[in-house]
């Protein structure tokens, strides 16, 4: 009786279990009732990082100077290149596609430690008492405003993101 | 395209003064915050001065407080930058950058050589 499922590394084609390419190695051909799987190795600045039944290896990353990028680890057959921005430039994303000059931090954030040439901007949240409804790479969290010393009262309470609202107070007639 | 063309930069000797300009063009400038950083030959970068959207809030470096003034004409869509008292190690290639700066949008900037 045919498998229905197939062991791991293996893929089930035409009612048989076929072994798949080892990583670095993409396929030819499938296996048949006479023949193995049979894979070839990938081409040079091409990679296959998992075990596979792909008939077409992947491009390594391009690290693009134009961008900022540089290489900080060449890719082999079994992983990609991985990018990395120039000195005192920082990448945008986990994955390093682009680069700035410093990340700014979001509303509801304010900027903990200013940029240097190594670090990037370092964000904190606005605790309790205070907000910012910008995005920044050098402004800190701004407390609320205090309507009391105004003489006024609180009419809209503030947010991580937004300033108090004041308003008059309720005079008795 | 963003383009920001740096202006203004010179020899100077120590203890004078000099005024940088910053010519934005490719976005809408009144609506981003500001910067000024520089590059001391062999160095590394360093910003220098920030200043938000509205020309209300700044930032300076310990290392320029009180010698430099950083201001903006959103109508005129130029940054500048006030530099006095200026000393040697303030020598440097300053560039204006906007937030978020990307790679590619970096220009060449201006040349501040300050020597006898």
């Known amino acids: 009786e045919p498998p229905t499922a197939c062991r791991e590394k293996q893929y089930l084609i035409n009612s048989q279990c076929c072994s798949l390419c080892q990583p670095g190695q993409k396929l030819v051909s499938d296996c048949t009732e006479f023949t193995e799987t049979e894979c070839l190795p990938c081409g040079e600045s091409e990679f296959l990082d998992t075990w596979n039944r792909e008939t077409h290896c992947h491009q390594h990353k391009y690290c693009d100077p134009n961008l900022g990028l540089r290489v900080q680890q060449k890719g082999t057959s079994e992983t990609d290149t991985i990018c990395t921005c120039e000195e005192g430039w920082h990448c945008t994303s986990e994955a390093c596609e682009s680069c700035v000059l410093h990340r700014s931090c979001s509303p509801g954030f304010g900027v903990k430690q200013i940029a240097t040439g190594v670090s990037d901007t370092i964000c904190e949240p606005c605790p309790v008492g205070f907000f910012s409804n910008v995005s920044s790479a050098f402004e800190k969290c701004h407390p609320w405003t205090s309507c009391e010393t105004k003489d006024l009262v609180v009419q809209q309470a503030g947010t991580n993101k937004t300033d108090v609202v004041c308003g008059p107070q309720d005079r008795l007639r | 395209e963003v383009q920001l063309l740096e202006s203004g930069g010179g020899l100077v000797q120590p203890g004078g003064s000099l005024r940088l300009s910053c010519a934005a063009s490719g976005f809408t400038f009144r609506d981003y915050e500001m910067w000024w950083v520089r590059q001391a030959p062999g160095k590394g970068l360093e910003r220098v001065s920030a200043i938000n959207p509205q020309g209300t809030r700044t930032y300076y470096a310990d290392s320029v407080k009180g010698r430099f003034t950083i201001s903006r004409d959103n109508s005129k869509n130029t940054l500048y930058l006030q530099m006095n008292s200026l000393r040697a190690e303030d020598t440097a290639v300053y560039h204006c950058?906007?937030?978020?700066?990307?790679?590619?949008?970096w220009g060449q900037g201006t040349l501040v050589t300050v020597s006898n």
């Open positions: 950058a906007k937030l978020p700066m990307f790679f590619e949008d």
